[in-house]
Interface confidence: low
């Protein structure tokens, strides 16, 4: 006679929540002759799912009609799946006895795990702000989706990265998962107004991938580039120091002014002009009057850019030597 | 029946790099991951990284990361592992092996290994 | 990473008597939510890539003959030939997947006596 096989095609069914879920069983004999009824786990606590003799089994309902003579499809349907359903089903054929049916064969089983989407994904920066040519890492998350295979991509101003490295946990099975990237994006001097996207596409998305977004903004700093010239004025002793401080980001930034050293002036940057790449221009200007001056003078500007050292460019106003000869016979 | 084919043995000498290819065929070629596992002579087996062929995903062994590079081909349903900066203890069988990924469909689970491809020999002399 | 460790390292038995291995992880491989433990055994015959014979720690690859057998749960298991053939002269690796990287014990040599 030939030998009875049990066969569970599927080894992994995934079911949303509210779905029905179909378990398939066919068996190849006919013998031993004895009933074939639906487990959920293995051993003393495994759970009676389906008995086609006896029970109440509402939310379950056969494919075929057991009841015919020459029947060896046993699959069930069962509806309105919720996250307690979720487990490993066997079906399992009992050979007729006495007093009792006893155990013959199990299938392989069907493990149930429920389909769900990954969260939308979560895009952060760097802790601290880097300056172009630097690179910077940007980390990607999403979670609680099942089943584990998942794509992501990141993505410059919409021009896909290669530059990351991706993980799926747990590495075991689980009801769920979660997926964690870090992307390496070196920086740009034009990267002010630049983003990054992490793109996140699942089974359950349908093709329509889910993104989360960062601003480069957050994470760059452009130091600022320093010209200094000086205008003489009309009046004749006075002299115009202008000092230029272009193409920074972010705004925070501080001028002081030094004359020989001691501080004459401190400000704040605050009526700024900004350029087409998201970086500011601004510019201070200092009157100095050189009349009372006997020697030259050294005019230094101190810009502190975003907390950080304090840039020095320093400029050499030369005192005429016949304003010198009258400032020393002031003195005298 | 699943069958994983590799490429032939390999010499090379120290500081290069080394591509060897695994083709799969009687199966869904996507659909479970391709690991990399490799043998020193005479010693036991060490797991170097895995590749989902249908997404593309990744994932090394913290010994071999910024060295193995694994890379897939869907037209042709082959994997390949280059391995670069190449020592003298890189001198090693390298395997391909399929995840058995018994609770998977095409998804990356990590699992035992069911099918395995004959070996590539890679020895490394100057 | 788990740290697989096998005894003894080499083995000699006798034909049609039982052989042993064991293999202890460094933490328990024993996944709780689905009472699997992620741990797989292997056969390696020279100059041929290792053959899996048991997975789930305790369940036999299709075509493995039944003489080969896994037990153990958590941290211990064994790996049983209830009568040695001389066919089964070779190398055997316990693999742990519970976590990643998987990894290997460093083999038993099984030869007759």
């Known amino acids: 006679e030939e030998e009875l096989q049990m066969i569970q095609p599927e080894k992994l069914l995934l079911v949303a929540v509210g779905e029905s879920a179909t378990l398939n069983c066919t068996v190849t004999s006919l013998l031993p002759v004895g009933p074939v009824l639906w487990f959920r786990g293995v051993g003393p606590g495994r759970e009676l799912i389906y008995n086609q003799k006896e029970g109440h089994f509402p939310r379950v309902t056969t494919v075929s009609d057991l009841t015919k003579r020459n029947n060896m499809d046993f699959s069930i349907r069962i509806s309105s799946i919720t996250p307690a359903d979720a487990g490993t089903y066997y079906c399992v054929k009992f050979r007729k006895g006495s007093p009792e049916n006893v155990e013959f064969k199990s299938g392989p089983g069907t493990e149930m795990a429920l389909r769900a989407k990954p969260s939308a994904p979560v895009v952060s920066g760097p802790a601290a702000r880097a300056t172009p040519e630097h690179t910077v890492s940007f980390t990607c998350k999403s979670h609680g989706f099942s089943p584990r295979d998942i794509t992501l991509k990141w993505f410059k101003n919409g021009n896909e990265l290669s530059d990351f490295q991706t993980n799926v946990d747990p590495a075991g099975q689980s009801v769920s998962y979660s997926i964690r990237s870090t992307a390496r994006v070196v920086l740009a001097p034009w990267d002010v107004r630049s983003q990054v996207t992490c793109e996140v596409a699942h089974v359950t998305l349908q093709g329509d991938p889910l993104r989360g977004t960062a601003n480069l903004s957050e994470a760059i700093r452009v130091p600022p580039t320093l010209e200094v010239t000086q205008q003489p004025m009309r009046a004749g002793n006075q002299v115009n120091i202008t000092y230029q401080v272009r193409n920074f980001y972010p705004q925070n930034l501080q001028l002081t002014w030094l004359e020989n050293g001691n501080v004459c002036r401190t400000e704040t940057a605050s009526t700024l002009t900004e350029n087409k790449d998201g970086t500011y221009n601004w510019t201070s200007w200092l009157l100095v009057n050189t009349s009372d001056q006997r020697d030259d003078v050294v005019l230094t500007c101190q810009v502190k850019h975003d907390g950080q050292l304090a840039v020095n460019k320093s400029l050499v106003l030369e005192v005429s030597a016949h304003q010198k000869d009258q400032s020393s016979d002031a003195t005298h | 029946q699943v069958q994983l084919v590799q490429s032939g043995a390999e010499v090379k000498k120290p500081g290069a790099s080394v591509k060897v290819s695994c083709k799969a065929s009687?199966?869904?070629?996507?659909?479970?991951?391709i690991n990399w596992v490799r043998q020193a002579p005479g010693q036991g087996l060490e797991w170097m990284g895995w590749?989902?062929?249908?997404?593309?995903?990744?994932g090394y062994a913290q010994k071999f990361q910024g060295r193995v590079t694994m890379t897939r081909d869907t037209s042709t349903s082959t994997v390949y592992m280059e391995l670069s900066s190449l020592r003298s203890e890189d001198t090693a069988v390298y395997y391909c092996?399929?995840?058995?990924?018994?609770?998977?469909?095409?998804?990356?689970?990590?699992?035992?290994?069911?099918?395995w491809g004959q070996g590539t020999l890679v020895t490394v002399s100057s | 990473d788990i740290v697989m460790t096998q005894s003894p390292d080499s083995l000699a038995v006798s034909l049609g008597e039982r052989a042993t291995i064991n293999c202890r992880s460094s933490?328990?491989?024993?996944?709780?939510?689905?009472?699997?433990?992620?741990l797989a055994w292997y056969q390696q015959k020279p100059g041929q890539p290792p053959k899996l014979l048991i997975y789930?720690?305790?369940t036999r690859e299709s075509g493995v003959p039944d003489r080969f057998s896994g037990s153990g749960s958590g941290t211990d298991f064994t790996l049983t030939i209830s009568s040695l053939q001389a066919e089964d002269v070779a190398v055997y690796y316990c693999?742990?997947?519970?976590?990643?990287?998987?990894?290997f014990g460093q083999g038993t040599k099984l030869e007759i006596k």
């Open positions: 590749m989902n062929p249908n997404s593309g995903n990744t």
């Open positions: 789930w720690a305790s």
């Open positions: 693999q742990q997947y519970y976590s990643t990287p998987p990894t």
């Open positions: 933490q328990s491989v024993l996944y709780s939510s689905n009472n699997k433990n992620y």
């Open positions: 009687g199966g869904t070629f996507s659909s479970y991951d």
């Open positions: 092996a399929r995840d058995l990924t018994l609770y998977c469909s095409s998804t990356s689970c990590l699992d035992a290994f069911d099918y």
